[in-house]
Every structure is written in C-alpha cells, then in structure tokens.
Interface confidence: medium
Amino acid sequence: ESGYAQNGDLEDAELDDYSFSCYSQLEVNGSQHSLTCAFEDPDVNTTNLEFEICGALVEVKCLSFRKLQEIYFIETKKFLLIGKSNICVKVGGKSLTCKKIDLTTIVKPEAPFDLSVIYREGANDFVVTFNTSHLQKKYVKVLMHDVAYRQEKDENKWMHVNLSSTKLTLLQRNLQPEAMYEIKVRSIPDHYFKGFWSEWSPSYYFRTPEINNSPGEMDP
C-alpha cells in the first residue's frame, strides 16, 4: 500500500514506487516556461511529497514545484535549456528518487486551435486550416502536426496525415459523400526539440456534399 513517510519511516517510503514523468512547455506564458510532473502510479499518496529541480537553471541552483491536486508544476524563466536537470521527489528534505532530464527533450507543445474546414466547389476538395501559438515563439517553432479525421459513424477508424504546415487539402473523392466527418489536430516538436504530442485541438465537424452538390463553407 502506498503511503507517505513519517520522519522516522523513510526506509518504508523507499519501498514505494515513486516513478514519475514530466513534460516541459516553453514560452507557454509570455517568456515563462513551465514544467509539469506527476507520479505514474495514480494511487501514490502524495501528502508530504515534494518535487525539486536542480541544475541547468539560470541564477538559482534549485527550484521547488507547486502542487496542484495530483500534479506538480513550475512556471519560470529560469530554465537554461541546454544541459540536464536533476528532478527529485523529496520527503522531509530527503530525496526518494531522482531523474536527470534535459528539458528540451520532454517538450509538449500547446494544442493547435482555430481548426476549420472549407469546401471548394470548383476544386472538389476541402481546405483544412488551423493555427498554432508556436509560430510566434522563439524556441519551439518547428513542429510536426498530425491531422486526424474520421467519419463520425466509424468510431475507431481515424485517418492520419502528418504535415509541417498549418494547411492541408483533402480531396473530395477520398471522402464519403453526404457524410458527417470529425477532424482534429495535434502537434509534436520537430528539429531541435524533442518530446510529446500536444493535446488534441477541439474537434471540428463538417459534412461532405452529395456528388455534384455545391455548398459554400461547411458549417460545423
């Protein structure tokens, strides 16, 4: 059973599984970066447990995380972004487990937004566009995007298209006529930074026309 350690019970605490994972978000709030960590075991009793990051920081040796329910969080400008940091789970000032992590290799981009689909009658295609906050960023500018779409009735039959731009054309002949489609997009760092897929954008829904039908913009 997972529990927290009293001061005299550190030996017992070390038997627990305190493995954790983290992701960073760069320039997530102006020039501020964030780092979010959480235990992999959702049943870990996090009372009295703290996270601390040391090394590869500007101006300070270490920073403590804030606890927000079951996650641990830092927002700061002080990430050096070259070099490995030591992230430790601590109780009563003693480290229970630590990981050396380069924050540039655990970047999770912000989710794309403003996803929309416009039908072009003359071209018989659908132009998918979306936006990403990363176009304005200094660091994580180069992303690969994963556009996923499916016919609404086909719950698990997602089609995926990877692209580096924020515009995609879907040919009408590759879609079923008179069908409702759901489409969404997510992003992952490409080039210098590494990491994880962003959250999915909100889904956009559009209907394909009948053959030879010619509506304008698809309404969600």
């Epitope: 040391c54 090394g55 590869a56 920081l57 500007v58 101006e59 300070v60 040796k61 050096l80 972004l81 070259i82 070099g83 490995k84 030591n86 050396k100 380069d102 540039t104 290799t105 200094k138 660091y139 210098y192």
Partner: antibody
Amino acid sequence: EVQLVESGGGLVQPGRSLRLSCAASGFTFDDHAMHWVRQAPGKGLEWVSGISWNSRGIGYADSVKGRFTIFRDNAKNSLYLQMNSLRAEDTALYYCAKDEYSRGYYVLDVWGQGTTVTVSS
Amino acid sequence: AIQLTQSPSSLSASVGDRVTITCRASQGISSALAWYQQKPGKAPKLLIYDASSLESGVPSRFSGSGSGTDFTLTISSLQPEDFATYYCQQFNSYPLWITFGQGTRLEIK
C-alpha cells in the same frame, strides 16, 4: 580526478586542415556540454565553439563559422574540433573546457592544459 | 552578440591593496556572469559564477557583485599569488554562445 587532455595540435600550412581531440575522464561526460576556447600568443581568451551533451545544441564564434566543426563521441568520452581552411589568425593555444551548468548557468569549471596550433607557411 | 568590456585593461597594485575590476555588458544579462583567473603558462581557473557565488576552494578575499549590465570583481587584500590576468565571461543558451571580456592584467607595483 576530473581531467581533460587535448591533443592534435601542430604546425600546419594555411588552407590545410587539423583535427583536435580532447579526452575526458573523472566525470560523467555525457551529462555536460563541452567547449573549445583559444588564446592567441599574448592575447585574451576567445571562445571558439560549444556543444551540448547530446550534440543537438551547437554554437560557433563568427570567426570560425563555416570552417570549424565541433563534435563529440560520448561512448569514447571524447570531444573533437575539425579545423578546415586554416588561417594565420587561427594560430593559438586551444583549450578544451567542461561546462558546469549546476552552478546556476554555464561556467567552465575544468580546463585542459591546451594544445598549440600554429598556422604558417 | 553581447559584448563584454573590462576596465581597466591593466593595473598595478601592491600586496595588501583592495582591487576592483569591472565588467560591463552591452545589454542586460541578469546575473549570468563568471570571473576567471589566468596565470602565465596556465589554463584559466574559475573564481566566481552567477555574478557573486564563490567557486569551491577559492579564497574568500575574492568576491563578485552586480546584475544586469555592470559587474565587479573585488580582491579585498591582494596576495602575491593573485597577480594574474582576470577575465569575465557571459553565456547565451540559445544558440549556445559564450563571450569573454578582453581581460585585465593585474601587476605588482
């Protein structure tokens, strides 16, 4: 004991190439960025190039950009500087240096004794 | 790139003197500055990092101060072994870039 030992310097004609090596020991090499710093005779320190622990972050001084290439082999605990199209003004003592980012930001806390490069016809 | 300008370029002082060397950055660098000492024929040695933190093993007569653009290295009471050249150093993390000041030569008067 933490140690950096440079090698590969020598006398070379202008326009030719040379490769410097730096053998590291006594610390976890692949936790640290590494740098080359040079010092021309009677002059000050000039940073030449730096490389992050995983080789994804690389920088060069303007004076060597396009001519010098920094690379590392973490399996061999070694840092290298490939110097092409050498010029007389590249004549200097070349130091290999280890960064120590746990100090709060990049500082060069361990230096080798240097290897001399002389470019002359 | 950010430029670092040290002053004076050289100075003469006597054992026991209090000595101050300044380093000015062409733009604000917070406290991201280090100081090194170099003796003839030797590799540089780290003295101060993070503008004011003393490196382990460095005598307490050395101190650093400053933030933003203006930084100071002070030797409170000069010892014979302190006669050397001193350099300030700044970094930029993206892209990886380091800049040194031009150096200050401290000589015996």
